[in-house]
């Protein structure tokens, strides 16, 4: 069944309470526009955002009988001329009579007549109508023939994109058959279709078809009010392409539209071939979109590649939410033109700073005020990491301007990094020289402490990503952070007693659930000695608070339990609820304290692995005193297993030094120069590109490094955790169904095969990755069973 027939069937279902063969139609309030009711329009009770009233009429081909419910009688079948009267197209019938078309459509043959309704004739320009009436034998006859086809074609035969030769000089009739059931002929809507006649079929349309002989190019060349657009099209080498065959839709900005543009913006775009071509192509669709087919908001891809949203508000058409179409449906032989009173500027023609929306104005204002905007050169490439307006507190805004400038510099990258270029473990360099880490989670991407929200865009000289908070690059290690905060003095002393200090000092990627001194309330010095005395017990307890991988609370899907494997080996349960992180259902007191080697979440209770039994009465007594949220198992004689710490020592990158370094004796006042020659370092890692793991080999050519004293600069080189670059497909901000996610082992930045699909914008589904094809990074440990 065709779309038209499906919508008609829906209308019939909605009208069946009124009797047989009754169809429900919706009329837009304040207009004469009626539509067969689609499911969507029925439930919305509106078309084009305007309220509708429901009318019940006989379905096409049926009629009422006096004293009977509904439309039980079938309409009489007649020749095409008689059928014009049956469907109420009496003006077209009259014109068919006076133009001597009548005998043709009463006689032998098979015809399709697209008959303008009486109202359509009334709406026709009076000069054109007078011209037809003054020359009925030629002009009127030709005009009517241009509404006819030499064979019977029902709506099911009227396929989208079809061009049918009319009975006047074979001039084309452009058929469009849209998914919402609207069928148009040269953008005139079929308002009553499929009225069968003995020698054909009649479709009533809502306007008179005017003759089409010109292309879009011809129209642009002839129309003085489009001279700015025409000149821009010539500059962009696009005018000629609008003369070619096709089914285009052109949203043509008038000269007034160009006048509204800030001069500097237009000058810059027109001076840049790439940007000016993008600007022009953004006004063109490769499909024919008649205004009558727009009954609600829909997104269309432009020739430029980005999308525009075309909507409607009563009789007006809006583009990207703004009412701007002031003349609709200028039909040409290769498409349709709608005149618009604003120039549409695609992101790809905008400077990176112009990509910011209403929610990032504080950021862009500050960038301008603090003189950073001038460093964003039109020919450079940048990435703005723009926090939303409410990320800037009054305290931040009242900071010393130099400090504020440094903060803002942390939000501008030296290179253009698109959303799909981001991967877990990536290091990004800011214009201030700071290094920012990227963390990719199931439904979020975070840079340092701040996670992205929807709305990433790519412009002419860069990209913009939107963030919930101000990005704060870490300055201190986990150990240093704990040491500078008195709240963690007991935990820190236990950590040092367990010989675990180094673990939190060295480079790495960790999540630490750090218990405050409150967690140890009531612990006596004897009990402390008891705990320290059993090193294995102490290590097990402390390492249960540490998880490989950086897990930012804001990166978690709200309301979903995330099960992580701790360094100790047992599972820990994390859940984000109402901006609060729950750790084993205990509320975190503070979360997302970033460090150079991980993140700290503060807890005020000691955590303990529920699956590990205690075999010592005194220790059990102490743990029961400190831990109230679980019942600790007691198994007499059981001991804590030793945890081999070698697994957690950071991996080092070995640099081969060819031969001994050269040293020379130097006089006082000279500097020491140590020249190290070395082979290139080959780095291998896996990136998931379009859903398929691809092993990438990166050769870092190690040039001579000259280390000069007395101010010795050095470079520490080490491999981080397993870097798996993900080309992400869909970035969901939505809260999805409350599912428990099971993440075990590794650095935890895992994607279930199906979930890659859900991550980043764009609906392209990722290919399914077979489980055995998942390639692991250099420092990943084995993954145990995983389940959804």
């Amino acid at each position: 069944n065709s779309y038209y027939d499906k919508v008609l069937a829906h209308s019939r279902i909605r009208g069946r309470d009124q009797g047989p063969n009754v169809c429900a139609l919706q009329q837009i309030l304040g207009t004469k526009k009626k539509y067969f009711s689609s499911c969507k329009n029925w439930y919305q009770g509106a078309i084009c955002g305007k309220k509708t009233t429901v009318l019940y009429e006989c379905c096409p081909g049926y009629m009422r009988m006096e004293g009977m419910k509904g439309c039980p009688a079938v309409m009489p079948i007649d020749h095409v001329y008689g059928t014009l009267g049956i469907v109420g197209a009496t003006t077209t019938q009259h014109y068919s009579d006076v133009s001597k078309l009548r005998e043709e459509i009463e006689g032998k043959g098979s015809y399709t007549y697209f008959a303008p309704s009486n109202e359509a004739w009334e709406n026709l320009d009076s000069d054109i109508r007078r011209g037809l009436e003054n020359n009925v034998n030629v002009e009127l006859l030709n005009a009517l023939h241009s509404h006819m086809v030499n064979k019977r074609m029902l709506t099911k035969d009227l396929k989208h994109g079809m061009v049918i030769p009319s009975m006047y000089n074979n001039l084309g009739l452009f058929i469009n058959h849209y998914p919402n059931g609207v069928v148009t002929v040269n953008c005139a809507r079929v308002i009553h279709g499929n009225q069968i006649a003995t020698n054909g079929v009649v479709h009533v349309i809502d306007r008179v078809l005017t003759q089409i002989g010109t292309s879009i190019q011809d129209f642009l060349e002839a129309e003085d009010d489009l001279s700015s657009f025409r000149a821009a099209a010539i500059t962009s080498d696009l005018l000629e392409s609008l003369g070619r065959d096709g089914h285009f839709t052109l949203f043509a900005p008038t000269n007034e539209a160009f006048e509204k543009l800030p001069r500097g913006v237009l000058e810059r775009i027109m001076g840049d071939k790439v940007a000016s071509e993008a600007l022009m192509k953004y006004h063109i669709l490769n499909t024919l979109q008649c205004s009558e087919a727009i009954t609600g908001g829909a997104v269309f891809e432009t020739m430029e590649g980005n999308t525009i949203e075309i909507g409607c508000e009563g009789d007006s058409i809006s583009i990207n939410g703004i009412k701007m179409v002031n003349k609709k449906d200028i039909v040409t032989k290769n498409g349709v033109i709608h005149l618009i009173d604003e120039v549409l500027i695609p992101d790809s023609a905008k400077q990176v700073i112009e990509l910011a929306g209403k929610q990032q104005t504080t950021f862009t204002d500050l960038v301008a005020q603090l003189g950073l905007a001038s460093s964003l050169k039109p020919d450079g490439e940048y990435t703005l990491l723009a926090p939303v307006n409410n990320a800037f507190s009054d305290d931040t805004l009242s900071m010393d301007q130099r400090l504020l400038k440094l903060i803002l510099q942390n939000h501008i990258l030296k290179v253009k990094v698109g959303l799909s270029d981001l991967y877990n473990g990536q290091i990004l360099e800011t214009i201030g020289g700071k290094q920012l880490r990227v963390f990719v989670y199931r439904t979020a991407i975070c840079i340092e402490n701040s996670c992205m929200v929807r709305g990433s865009k790519q412009g002419r000289n860069g990209a913009i990503h939107i963030f919930r908070e101000i990005i704060q690059p870490a300055e201190k290690s986990l150990h240093d952070k704990l040491r500078q905060d008195k709240r963690f003095s007991i935990f820190l002393s236990l950590l040092e007693a367990a010989d675990l200090k180094d673990l939190l000092t060295q480079p790495g990627d960790w999540t630490l659930f750090a218990p405050t001194n409150d967690a140890f309330k009531g612990m006596t010095s004897e009990e402390r000695e008891l705990l320290i005395g059993d090193k294995n017990a102490l290590q097990n307890i402390i390492l249960y608070h540490l998880t490989p991988g950086v897990y930012i609370g804001k990166g978690f899907e709200p309301g979903v339990t995330n099960i992580l494997k701790t360094t100790q080996g047992s599972k820990i349960y994390l859940k984000g609820v109402n901006e609060t992180l729950l750790v084993n259902e205990l509320k975190s007191k503070e979360s997302d304290i970033m460090t150079t080697n991980g993140v700290i979440h503060v807890v005020d209770k000691l955590l303990y692995p529920a699956d590990i039994p205690v075999g010592n009465d005194q220790l059990l007594e102490l743990l029961n005193k400190l831990i109230k949220y679980i019942q600790i198992k007691f198994v007499r004689g059981s001991t804590f297993k030793e945890i081999p710490m070698t697994v957690y020592r950071p991996a080092m990158t070995k640099i081969q030094i060819e031969g001994d370094p050269d040293f020379r004796l130097i006089k006082e006042g000279e500097t020491v120069t140590e020249v190290i020659h070395g082979e290139p370092v080959i780095k291998k890692y896996t990136k998931i590109i379009d859903g398929v793991p691809v092993e990438i080999t990166e050769k870092q050519t190690r040039e001579e490094r000259i280390i000069t004293g007395p101010e010795i600069k050095y470079t520490r080189i080490s491999t981080g955790g397993g870097e798996t670059g993900e080309t992400l497909q869909k970035f969901l901000q939505k809260e999805v169904s409350k599912v428990t996610k099971f993440i075990e082992g590794g650095d935890g930045h895992l994607f279930e095969d199906e979930e890659i699909k859900r991550l980043l914008q764009g609906d392209t589904p990722a290919k399914k990755i077979p489980a055995n094809k998942r390639v692991q990074g250099p420092r990943r440990r084995s993954r145990e069973g995983r389940s959804q």
């Epitope: 003085d224 009010d225 001279s227 700015s228 657009f229 000149a231 821009a232 500059t235 008038t254 000269n255 007034e256 160009f258 006048e259 509204k260 543009l261 001069r263 500097g264 237009l266 000058e267 810059r268 027109m270 001076g271 840049d272 000016s276 050169k377 039109p378 020919d379």
Partner: antibody, heavy 118, light 110 residues
Framework: QVQLVQSGAEVKKPGASVKVSCKAS????????ISWVRQAPGQGLEWMGW????????NYAQKLQGRVTMTTDTSTSTAYMELRSLRSDDTAVYYC???????????WGQGTLVTVSS | QSVLTQSSSASGTPGQTVTVSCSGS????????VNWYQQLPGTAPKLLIY???QRPSGVPDRFSGSKSGTSASLAISGLQSADEADYYC???????????FGSGTKVTVL
Amino acid sequence: QVQLVQSGAEVKKPGASVKVSCKASGYTFTSYGISWVRQAPGQGLEWMGWISAYDGNTNYAQKLQGRVTMTTDTSTSTAYMELRSLRSDDTAVYYCARDMLVVPFDYWGQGTLVTVSS
Amino acid sequence: QSVLTQSSSASGTPGQTVTVSCSGSSSDIGSNRVNWYQQLPGTAPKLLIYSNDQRPSGVPDRFSGSKSGTSASLAISGLQSADEADYYCAAWDDSLSTYVFGSGTKVTVL
């Protein structure tokens, strides 16, 4: 055809004001802007500013900000440029030009000589 | 003091090609398009080239424009005596938010 006809020559004393008119014909006046450009004797061209005939939006050269006012009268398809606090270095030929933005200054008026002399 | 720099004069014999250069900065020519105007002696200027290399209708194809980085040039091939005039380059300047002209180049046909 497109024509821009400017008012006649003016002689003004320093400190006075001058108002030059530019009547447009042969095109839809509100569909284009008007720019004003001046040329001192034996010198190059200097852009003074622009006005959109569609909505009266203006953009003046920084140098003249506060001294120049550009207006349009759509009923007569005429653009005006008023320059106040005249100085001797304002002596120049003042041109109006149709400004399509995409195609800047595609048609020019014949010019109006303004002489500032005490 | 013009923001765009042009050589003060250029000359050639009939039939020759003459090139007029125009130098600017990243805030004008570097970021925006260049337009060229011809001013015959005693007349108003006339648009010759817009958007770096586009000729308005009626301008012979002997005139061609190009832009590279922060400089632009106008080439006049098949030089004719009627081409004797002043030639001005112009561009929008982002930093000044002003439309700036070059100092002008007088082309003489020998």
